[in-house]
């Protein structure tokens, strides 16, 4: 791995908690200000593997609201606008980090948590298993 | 919003830092143990809008490695295995939270940061039709 020289201006940490417990500034720095806001707003409808977005809310988690994609069809939309069941709509999933309040209901103490979310859907060719 | 009753066992917080700076336990709780590890391992190749995965590494960020999808084609793969340029392969993007070391090179002090990542690609129909 890459060794990072320690900055002498770092906050102190007690050995018993270090490196498991860290200080995190929740004032979010958003690196996405240069992106096009239209970037994917209508893909869920225009895709050959369209999806619906479901709101998942949990006040004990940060961010408290996460949107989950659910593919609308088992197959994919063909050029005629019909569902082609020779193809499969599948969710594209990603592991993301969230903060979970720990102990519960504490406003300033969290634990890092990994969750799997479906971001959208894509159309794939099925793997056909032939039975002799 | 939902008001959460405060747990009397919460760590203390100084008003000057609260609620911007919080304590976070980095021992990750993984909620994904029941997921199929193969869940989307080959979708990038089997999709009608296939993609390559690009490793993005930054030692000042947690997680330090993020995989970014890059769509392989301008169009989408049709039933004959050729690229159909009347369709578009587009990246499905998601804003995710990461931790950025702040001040730089500090092992136990971070700031929350939002970044936009491309998770995979999907095939969409254009809404503006080409005039020859």
């Amino acid at each position: 791995g890459i060794t990072i020289p320690r900055n002498p201006g770092c906050p102190n940490s007690e050995d018993k908690n270090f490196p498991r417990t860290v200080m995190v500034n929740l004032n979010i720095h958003n690196r996405n200000t240069n992106t096009n806001p239209k970037r994917s707003s209508d893909y869920y409808n225009r895709s050959t593997s369209p999806w619906n977005l479901h709101r998942n809310e949990d006040p004990e988690r940060y961010p408290s609201v996460i949107w989950e994609a659910k593919c609308r069809h088992l197959g994919c939309i063909n050029a005629d606008g019909n569902v082609d069941y020779h193809m499969n709509s599948v969710p594209i999933q990603q592991e993301i980090l969230v903060l979970r309040r720990e102990p519960p209901h504490c406003p300033n103490s969290f634990r890092l948590e990994k969750i799997l979310v479906s971001v959208g859907c894509t159309c794939v060719t099925p793997i056909v298993h032939h039975v002799a | 919003g939902i008001t959460i009753p405060r747990n009397p066992g919460c760590p203390n917080s100084e008003d000057k830092n609260f609620p911007r700076t919080v304590m976070v336990n980095l021992n990750i709780h993984n909620r994904n143990t029941n997921t199929n590890p193969k869940r989307s391992s080959d979708y990038y190749n089997r999709s009608t809008s296939p993609w390559n995965l690009h490793r993005n590494e930054d030692p000042e960020r947690y997680p330090s490695v993020i995989w970014e999808a890059k769509c392989r084609h301008l169009g989408c793969i049709n039933a004959d295995g050729n690229v159909d340029y009347h369709m578009n392969s587009v990246p499905i993007q998601q804003e995710i939270l990461v931790l950025r070391r702040e001040p730089p090179h500090c092992p136990n002090s971070f700031r929350l940061e939002k970044i936009l990542v491309s998770v995979g690609c999907t095939c969409v129909t254009p809404i503006v039709h080409h005039v020859a």
Partner: nanobody
Framework: EVQLVESGGGLVQAGGSLRLSCAAS????????MGWFRQAPGKEREFVAA????????AVATFVKGRFTISRDNARNTVYLHMSSLKPEDTAVYHC??????????????????WGQGTQVTVSS
């Protein structure tokens, strides 16, 4: 913001070759499909070539097919336009652009949001 800077233009004789470069700063170029467009005096800007995010797929306008190719080096954050068998009618200002939306096909100019200032290519007979 993404800043795009073209270079490599110049004066060349008919039948000659040039390689145009488009270097990006700001967000990494691999986040976008890229395109080259050109604008001749008194004419509208027209599509020349496009390349996918990964660089695996390219498309060129029919009037430059077999003469122009597009490539990219994501590690260097640079896109290239390789031009050979140049003709006087290829004289124009060549612009590179980053595609940020997908309303039309790869050659739909309005889908490209980030543009360079352009580099002049002059082909003499």
């Amino acid at each position: 913001e993404v800043q795009l800077v073209e270079s490599g233009g110049g004066l060349v004789q008919a039948g000659g070759s040039l390689r145009l470069s488009c270097a990006a700063s700001g967000r990494t170029l691999y986040s976008y499909p890229m395109g080259w467009f050109r604008q001749a005096p008194g004419k509208e800007r027209e599509f020349v070539a496009a390349i996918s995010m990964s660089g695996d797929d390219t498309a060129v306008a029919t009037f430059v097919k077999g003469r122009f190719t597009i490539s990219r080096d994501n590690a260097r954050n640079t896109v290239y336009l390789h031009m050979s068998s140049l003709k006087p009618e290829d004289t124009a200002v060549y612009h590179c652009a980053a595609r940020t939306s997908y309303s039309g096909r790869y050659d739909y100019i309005d889908d490209y949001s980030y543009w360079g200032q352009g580099t002049q290519v002059t082909v003499s007979s």
